[in-house]
Amino acid sequence: VLEVYYTSLRCRCVQESSVFIPRRFIDRIQILPRGNGCPRKEIIVWKKNKSIVCVDPQAEWIQRMMEVLRKRSSSTLPVPVFKRKIP
């Protein structure tokens, strides 16, 4: 569910939302760290209705959710916490 990608692309998110999305409607969360042409961290959420939204990394709900997912991933080894995609 939680993925970190390192890409050579510039920023992917034109607009960010802080609107709450419950975990039950989230399919996948992709984290794009700062760097490689983008000066900010980006969080992309794939929803279960196939739509995609960029979420403000400062939104409290996404920070809480990522912490829960990290804990959950680390307690269910051998599933990796992060998937790395090397360009």
Epitope: F20, R24, V68, R72
Partner: antibody, heavy 123, light 106 residues
Framework: EVQLVESGGGLVQPGGSLRLSCAAS????????MSWVRQAPGKGLEWVAT????????YYPDNVKGRFTISRDNAKNSLYLQMNSLRAEDTAVYYC????????????????WGQGTLVTVSS | DIQMTQSPSSLSASVGDRVTITCKAS??????IAWYQQKPGKAPKLLIY???TLQPGVPSRFSGSGSGTDFTFTISSLQPEDIATYYC????????FGGGTKLEIK
């Protein structure tokens, strides 16, 4: 006091269409997601659809996807369910329910429910 | 899709008895389970959410426990007004209800 009142149920032939409505009061309607849940006669509960507080996102289980459409009018405090290509197995009492608080961080499920409206699909 | 297996499907108990209903999820749902009470001809009423959080106004004789895939709903001392059908609901991944437990008085 939170109140949800469904209407629009009735008898419809297989293949037909019906539009259900739910009038909400007693809370800030535009701050909450809303859902429809159904219950076939003598059977259990089954989730049908959910719409986000602003109406931009809708979610459905596979068995109604493409046939049912959930929508809302926040100015009228109203929720709707458009049901097309109805089948005998869609016969049920349809409940509207208040869902998660859109401005919150905590995840809670459907908390308040209406009394339901009966939809009968039969020839 | 997540399946919720609720048991028993029906049970008979006496006033004052401790009553336990279980729900088993087909995969880990963390603590995202709720319990509803439905009386004949009425709408479901939320009793408990997030496994053990009591909805305001719900008597303290109702409680919930569990995590992961196994969950329990308990009525510590059955009252006549508790006669109803009880449903669990997982809301970790979309929504799935359990099949229900019809509770009757002996």
């Amino acid at each position: 006091e939170v109140q949800l009142v469904e209407s629009g149920g009735g008898l419809v032939q297989p293949g037909g269409s019906l539009r259900l409505s739910c009038a909400a009061s007693g809370f800030t309607f535009s701050s909450y997601a809303m859902s429809w849940v159904r219950q076939a006669p003598g059977k259990g509960l089954e989730w049908v659809a959910t719409i986000s507080e602003g109406g931009s996102d809708a979610y459905y289980p596979d068995n109604v996807k493409g046939r049912f459409t959930i929508s809302r009018d926040n100015a009228k405090n109203s929720l709707y369910l458009q049901m097309n290509s109805l089948r005998a197995e869609d016969t049920a009492v349809y409940y509207c329910a208040r869902d998660y608080y859109g401005s919150g961080y905590e995840e809670s499920p459907m908390d308040y429910w209406g009394q339901g409206t009966l939809v009968t699909v039969s020839s | 899709d997540i399946q919720m297996t609720q048991s028993p499907s029906s049970l008979s108990a006496s006033v004052g008895d401790r009553v336990t209903i279980t729900c088993k999820a087909s995969q880990d749902i963390n603590k995202y389970i709720a319990w509803y009470q439905q009386k004949p001809g009425k709408a479901p009423k939320l009793l408990i959410y997030y496994t053990s959080t009591l909805q305001p106004g719900v008597p303290s004789r109702f409680s919930g426990s569990g995590s992961g895939t196994d969950f329990t709903f308990t009525i510590s001392s059955l009252q006549p007004e508790d006669i109803a059908t009880y449903y669990c609901l997982q809301y970790d991944n979309l929504y799935t209800f359990g099949g229900g437990t019809k509770l009757e008085i002996k």
